[in-house]
């Protein structure tokens, strides 16, 4: 699996996309990293 | 204009301590995601530390070489990075670089500073 | 953690020519590579993000291509001022890790 930060963002976006644009106050992102590192 | 600038570099003893600071100016600070990442004298590069957003609950993460050492932490109010080193050891002899990113969709942003030099030895 | 192996250690090229930088990894890092360029006594600049896409204000003679295990930075016509030390480094699994970099030089 993805262990970095733009993991991170790509599965924040599918979730934004699947709820509306809302995401909950307590979604904390799994151990992932980001492709602008 | 963004502006990334360490300081806190310097001489210190084996065994001794060194905090690094980051101020950054021209942007969101909290939005990023921070990384210090080292080079030692004509070496390559080596990611240290990482600190992520305060939204992904400013979670860390380290390279094993410093872990239990190093503690890297942020204040998004004063737009500042920090780096703690314990018990620092000569092969963390190097100049300290901080590297800010952020990435959503195309909005990739990724702004490194001029660095400081942290130099261990008795 | 994931190795990245670069080749070669040194390329000796003239202005004009086209570079190709290999980046091998120990394992599978899906796209998750980028590319930079160092200066003597500056700091790293990024090139590449994502395996093939070109930073903002990035000239088009860079690009970068590549997936799974094997990675390369091609610079499609040397400019004297390209003449530096290029890193890879993956953002896929934690540690991050950079390659041992590739230095090139004027032939």
């Known amino acids: 699996a993805c262990d970095t930060a733009t993991c991170v963002t790509h599965r924040l976006a599918g979730l934004l996309s699947r709820s509306g644009g809302v995401v909950k106050n307590n979604f904390v992102p799994t151990n992932v990293g980001s492709k602008a590192f | 204009e963004v502006q990334l600038v360490e300081s806190g570099g310097g001489l210190v003893q084996p065994g001794g301590s060194l905090r690094l600071s980051c101020a950054a100016s021209g942007f969101t600070f909290s939005n990023y995601w921070i990384s210090w990442v080292r080079q030692a004298p004509g070496k390559g590069l080596e990611w240290v530390a990482e600190i992520r957003s305060e939204s992904d609950a400013s979670a860390t993460h380290y390279a094993e070489a410093v872990k239990g050492r190093f503690t890297i932490s942020r204040d998004n109010a004063k737009n500042s990075l920090y780096l703690q080193m314990n018990s620092l050891r000569a092969e963390d002899t190097a100049v300290y670089y901080c590297?800010?990113?952020?990435?959503?969709?195309?909005?990739?942003?990724?702004?490194w500073g001029q660095g400081t030099l942290v130099t261990v030895s008795s | 953690e994931i190795v990245l192996t670069q080749s070669p250690a040194t390329l000796s090229l003239s202005p004009g020519e086209r570079a190709t930088l290999s980046c091998k990894a120990s394992?599978?890092?899906?796209?998750?590579v980028s590319w930079y360029q160092q200066k003597p006594g500056q700091a790293p600049r990024l090139l590449i993000y994502g395996a093939s896409n070109r930073y903002l204000g990035i000239p088009a003679r860079f690009s970068g291509s590549g997936s799974g295990t094997d990675f390369t930075l091609t610079i499609s016509s040397l400019e004297p001022e390209d003449f530096a030390v290029y890193y890879c480094s993956q953002s896929y699994n934690y540690p991050y890790t950079f390659g041992q970099g590739t230095k090139l030089e004027i032939k």
């Open positions: 590297l800010l990113y952020f990435d959503y969709g195309l909005a990739i942003q990724n702004y």
């Open positions: 394992k599978r890092v899906t796209t998750y």
